[in-house]
């Protein structure tokens, strides 16, 4: 078990032209808060995958009102650390997602408006117990400066917080500055190197250069029995000069409550009152619940009544994401059929349908031929949302009202001559060809006969219709 800690140092416009003057919109003042999400591994996880290692929300920052003539380079931030306790082993490789959220405080429909201002993702390797790692990340036009670390909480130790160690009053078989680990007493914790001369029997350290004393011993090197010393009664890690550990007068001594929890004594024990977002005997476990208000943009929090059950946000139409933080481009799903134009009105989708189609999604094909007559014996054909007339021979145009020349398309192949006729057209084929369109060569041994022109028609007189 342990705690991942994130310290936001600054958030403000990045360098260069085009940097925003204010995080607030034109609607008025706003304030910032942060959400940290930890995911195991270094793989490119889907944005919607859960924060399996834990998540935390910061408090709201001070209200910011833009001063147009003097934009603040760094915006007022929430105080304090963001802490994400982890129950199991620290994975070493992880994805760190830091979201900067804006809460607009002007008159908003449905309460304050929440919007994601910036999101940075870092995939890192980090050993527990190491120093603070500093980072600067850009997200669009914004710049975020932060530090982070992972630390184990006793009795867990090691780079993954998996080994359970405890100081022992028995003489140690470990080397200088090292303490034995339980349950394997012969295994020794990896060093920090304690202050030179720190008693191997009565002292131990958690930080390099430190010398902490076991109960009953004191002095800068834990060589002096406490009963004969003028013990200062310091508890916890001593300063670099002196200190000792003495039996605490009460169960809340040294405040066993993590993550800002407050301790109150109960008969023979203690009770931690945990801040929002944490629970457990010592407030050591992170558990964002529905009580933390994790759903934005009018989302409804479902489940998550207790920290052991995950919450789900049911998002209003137009929003998505695990916290309803993303606006959906609903038209990207192409809901309008048959070539309809999609309009996202915010409260609803509208489809503007092409001629011949109707319905909320343009799904209904109207009867294109309703009330439409085709002249001169033409028949109406539906399709594509626009009516079309299939005209009788000799007629054309949208409604078959125009006279058409059946020979205009030169239907007779191989030099055949075309004769327009009331029942269609006739091809007079050139020698050596036959067929209704003169498309077949006559076999050499066959006889070719040129059909005579129909009575009443002269070749080359296509304009004459009977």
């Amino acid at each position: 078990a342990g705690v991942f800690e994130l310290q936001i140092h600054s958030f403000g416009p990045g360098p260069g032209p085009g940097a925003p003057r204010s995080p607030c919109s034109a609607r008025g003042p706003c304030r910032l808060f942060f959400r940290v999400c930890l995911k195991p591994g270094l793989s490119e996880e889907a944005a919607e995958s859960p924060c399996a290692l834990g998540a935390a929300l910061s408090a709201r920052g001070p209200v910011y009102t833009e001063q147009p003539e003097a934009p603040a380079p760094d915006l007022p931030l929430p105080n304090g650390l963001l802490q994400v306790p982890f129950r199991d082993a620290w994975p070493g490789t992880f994805s760190l997602i830091i979201e900067t959220w804006r809460e607009e405080l002007g008159d908003q429909i449905g309460g304050p408006a929440w919007s994601l201002l910036a999101r940075v993702t870092r995939r890192r390797r980090l050993a527990a117990g190491g120093p603070w790692a500093r980072d600067i990340q850009r997200a669009g036009a914004w710049e975020l400066r932060f530090s982070y670390r992972a630390r184990c909480e006793l009795p867990a130790v090691g780079t993954a917080c998996t080994r359970l160690c405890r100081p022992r009053s028995a003489p140690s078989r470990c080397g200088p500055g090292l303490r034995p680990c339980a349950p394997l007493e012969d295994e020794c914790e990896a060093p920090p190197v304690c202050r030179a001369g720190c008693s191997l029997e009565h002292g131990f350290c958690e930080q390099p250069g430190e010398c902490r004393c076991l109960e009953g011993w004191t002095g800068p090197l834990c060589m002096v029995p406490a009963s004969t010393s003028s013990c200062l009664g310091l508890r916890g890690p001593s300063s670099a000069t002196t200190g000792c550990l003495v039996p605490g007068p009460g169960p809340c001594d040294g405040n066993p409550c993590a993550n800002g929890g407050s301790c109150s004594e109960t008969p023979g024990s203690f009770e931690c009152t945990c801040p929002r977002g944490f629970y457990g005997l010592r407030c050591e476990v992170s558990g964002v619940t529905c009580a933390d208000g994790p759903c934005f943009n009018g989302g409804l929090c479902v489940g998550g009544a207790d920290p052991d059950s995950a919450y789900i946000c049911h998002c209003p139409p137009g929003f998505q994401g695990s916290n309803c933080e993303k606006r959906v481009d609903r038209c990207s799903l192409q809901p309008c059929r048959n070539g309809g134009l999609c309009l996202d009105l915010g409260h609803a989708l509208r489809c503007r349908c092409r001629a011949g189609f109707a319905g909320p999604r343009c799904e209904h094909n109207l009867d294109d031929c309703a009330g439409r007559a085709c002249a001169n014996g033409g028949t109406c054909v539906e399709g594509g949302g626009a009516h079309r007339c299939s005209c009788a021979l000799g007629f054309g145009g949208r409604d078959c009202r125009e006279r058409a020349d059946p020979c205009a398309a030169r239907p007779c192949a191989h030099g055949g001559r075309c004769y327009a006729h009331f029942s269609g057209l006739v091809c007079a084929c050139a020698p050596g060809y036959m067929g209704s369109r003169c498309e077949f060569p006559v076999h050499p041994d066959g006889v070719s006969a040129l059909p005579a022109a129909p009575p009443g028609l002269r070749p080359g007189d296509p304009q004459r219709y009977l």
């Epitope: 449905g110 309460g111 304050p112 529905c290 009018g298 409804l300 049911h314 209003p316 915010g346």
Partner: antibody
Framework: QVQLQESGPGLVKPSETLSLTCTVS????????WSWIRQPPGKGLEWIGY???????NYNPSLKSRVTISVDTSKNQFSLKLSSVTAADTAVYYC????????????WGQGTLVTVSS | EIVLTQSPGTLSLSPGERATLSCRAS???????LAWYQQKPGQAPRLLIY???SRATGIPDRFSGSGSGTDFTLTISRLEPEDFAVYYC?????????FGGGTKVEIK
């Protein structure tokens, strides 16, 4: 103008299943969440559950084991089924549209009284 | 679940008077996700206020909502004859959606 109309039998026998349908006009059922709320005679309002056209549902835990809400987008309708009814389920049943700005109810049907009696 | 307690149960006032209705939540309602409804006998409820203080479309400005956290108030600045009805609050912060028990505003 958005309108909702409840329909279904006004009398149901104990232990049977209450079935109601809400027909929506003036709004696409695919664009909103839709809900059922009931009100026993002379008493307050009780939320039953809601549905989204995608099939997402959420029910009141006090009724969850007996409730099914379904949607028919082709008919612009959604329905309520409440099984194993008792006299305590006698109420006016309202269908309502859930607003876009949050999970409150901006349009309601006029309600239909369902009496559970043998 | 969040339990909403409305008080008083009944408010007896005359037309022209100011009505103040209270709705108290058993847990904090995040982001002021609270709505108010008016219901007249034989009718469905009608949305008045959402987001604790935003008036719904077509609602006269004599109706106003305020409050945050666990304490919310609906105020009718000058009662009109048509305002005598039962008023309900509803939270939509988390599931299950819950209503208050109602406050009846009757003519004195």
């Amino acid at each position: 103008q958005v309108q909702l109309q409840e329909s279904g039998p006004g009398l149901v026998k104990p232990s049977e299943t209450l079935s109601l349908t809400c027909t929506v006009s003036g709004a696409s059922i695919s664009s909103f969440y839709w809900s059922w709320i009931r009100q026993p005679p002379g008493k307050g309002l009780e939320w039953i559950g809601y549905i989204y056209y995608s099939g997402t549902t959420n029910y009141n835990p006090s009724l969850k084991s007996r409730v099914t809400i379904s949607v028919d987008t082709s008919k612009n309708q959604f329905s309520l089924k409440l099984s194993s009814v008792t006299a305590a389920d006698t109420a006016v049943y309202y269908c309502a549209r859930i607003a876009v700005a949050g999970f409150f109810f901006d349009y309601w049907g006029q309600g239909t009284l369902v009496t559970v009696s043998s | 679940e969040i339990v909403l307690t409305q008080s008083p149960g009944t408010l007896s006032l005359s037309p022209g008077e100011r009505a103040t209705l209270s709705c108290r939540a058993s847990q904090s309602v995040n982001k002021n996700y609270l709505a108010w409804y008016q219901q007249k006998p034989g009718q469905a409820p009608r949305l008045l206020i959402y987001g604790a203080s935003s008036r719904a479309t077509g609602i006269p400005d004599r109706f106003s909502g305020s409050g945050s956290g666990t304490d919310f108030t609906l105020t009718i600045s000058r009662l009109e004859p048509e305002d005598f009805a039962v008023y309900y609050c509803q939270q939509y912060d988390r599931s299950p959606l819950t209503f208050g028990g109602g406050t009846k505003v009757e003519i004195k």
